[in-house]
């Protein structure tokens, strides 16, 4: 299971994982405290018949050629968590691990 | 975390879970003993901003916009496995569990 | 036989807009990269743009980021430029052009068009 | 951006002589470079892909070498149909950028 992994710059036609900084501050979220800023990555590219598919799945639906089907996309297919202490909807100050922040590996699904 | 449910004439435009049955023996997977077939779903339709995002990773991308990014794509969001009877390679009977055969669920990511 | 035909140039005033299109023809169209490279009246080539054989990705020169815009229609086997904003200095003929795919790398194009002139004058 | 340098800008050369035109990039784009010709009032025409290797129907004479930094295009023996300007681009990096050209012309 891998994915490639790419630079802001390169020409890869193909699904690969690209870094990304978001910046909480700059989009105005301003009911987060920390981070202000994190490397969040992105997935972005073509998905070629086989290339990366992490599913037998995609495959037999690529083969069984259902109406409206599109092919594979390029999607996170590893996804980690950070850490982050934020204001909820009280005004209640909350440290916790929020899932799915940082995508690890990209691939075709 | 939820998702929608379709049948194949449906005229919804989002992102949508739809019935598929795969048919081994169709594809002329003869290695496969059984099932010979199977409901596998599958996934079909837009992912308009926010609507069926699995991860808020999803909504900063947009929001970033970086260079080369594409929308989120109507994509498994979670998916279970089946049991199967099938050949290998050395020609030896195996029974096991095959990971991520069915779509349970669509989402944008 | 593998072709492409620009259409959709002409003379606007500066701050317009004009939209380009690109017929193929001779391929699988939906299979391959496009891009629109220009050239100016007696200068040499600039890439102005690309788009991926699916249209989810695309990518602009900084000189026309945020006023051009690429798409594709696959089932109609059509690149588009729509150019707003319009300036003395992107009067050029501006060529399409087919994605080689030699390996994972866009950009090396194998087919262009004999382009389409734009003028941007007062 | 990548900064594409040729030499020379005019190359003036005798028909069935050699030709050896260079393309220097500003940073390494690997062997991803390709060369074009171009005559008066026509589209580009591709030459050379990957550095080194020939586009469909493109004669022998022409050759492609080097990678990194460093290429050259060199045309064994000049026919009055190569007379024309020829590009290098590097598709390696956005933006693509190309160089400004070699004029190729009957000395």
């Known amino acids: 299971d891998f994915g490639l992994d790419c630079d802001e710059h390169s020409t890869e036609s193909r699904c690969c994982r690209y870094p990304l900084t978001v910046d909480f501050e700059a989009f105005g979220w301003d009911w987060i405290i920390a981070p202000k800023r994190y490397k969040a990555n992105y997935c972005s590219g073509e998905c070629e018949f086989v290339f990366l598919q992490k599913y037998p799945h995609t495959h037999l639906v690529h083969q069984a050629n259902p109406r409206g089907s599109a092919g594979p996309c390029c999607t996170p297919t590893k996804m980690s968590p950070i850490n982050m202490l934020y204001f909820n909807g009280k005004e209640q100050i909350i440290y916790g691990k929020i899932p799915a922040m940082v995508v690890d590996r990209c691939g075709c699904s | 975390d939820f998702g929608l449910d379709c049948d194949e004439h449906s005229t919804e435009s989002r992102c949508c879970r739809y019935p598929l049955t795969v048919d081994f023996e169709a594809f002329g997977w003869d290695w496969i003993i059984a099932p010979k077939r199977y409901k596998a779903n599958y996934c079909s339709g837009e992912c308009e901003f926010v609507f069926l995002q699995k991860y808020p990773h999803t909504h900063l991308v947009h929001q970033a916009n970086p260079r080369g990014s594409a929308g989120p794509c109507c994509t498994p969001t979670k998916m279970s496995p089946i049991n199967m009877l099938y050949f290998n390679g050395k020609e030896q009977i195996i029974y096991g569990k095959i990971p991520a055969m069915v779509v349970d669920r669509c989402g944008c990511s | 036989e593998v072709q492409l035909l620009e259409s959709g140039g002409g003379l606007v005033q500066p701050g317009g807009s004009l939209r380009l299109s690109c017929a193929a023809s001779?391929?699988?169209?939906?299979?391959?990269?496009m891009s629109w490279v220009r050239q100016a009246p007696g200068k040499g080539l600039e890439w102005v743009s690309a788009?991926?054989?699916?249209?989810?990705?695309?990518f602009y020169a900084d000189s026309v980021t945020g006023r051009f815009t690429i798409s594709r229609d696959n089932s109609k086997n059509t690149l588009f430029l729509q150019l707003n904003s319009l300036r003395a200095e992107d009067t050029a003929v501006y060529h399409c052009?087919?994605?080689?795919?030699?390996?994972?790398?866009?950009?090396?194009?194998?087919?262009w068009g004999q382009g389409t002139m734009v003028t941007v004058s007062s | 951006e990548i900064v594409m340098t040729q030499s020379p800008a005019t190359l003036s050369v005798s028909p069935g002589e050699r030709a050896t035109l260079s393309c220097r990039t500003s940073?390494?784009?690997?062997?991803?470079l390709a060369w074009y010709q171009q005559k008066p009032g026509q589209a580009p025409r591709l030459l050379i892909y990957g550095a080194s290797t020939r586009a469909t129907g493109i004669p022998a004479r022409f050759s492609g070498s080097g990678s990194g930094t460093e290429f050259t295009l060199t045309i064994s023996s000049l026919q009055s149909e190569d007379f024309a300007v020829y590009y290098c681009q590097q598709y390696n990096n956005w933006p693509l950028t190309f160089g400004g050209g070699t004029k190729v012309e009957i000395k």
């Open positions: 940073q390494s784009v690997s062997s991803n």
């Open positions: 788009i991926s054989g699916s249209g989810g990705s695309t």
């Open positions: 001779g391929f699988t169209f939906s299979s391959y990269a």
């Open positions: 052009a087919k994605d080689g795919r030699f390996n994972w790398n866009y950009g090396a194009s194998d087919i």
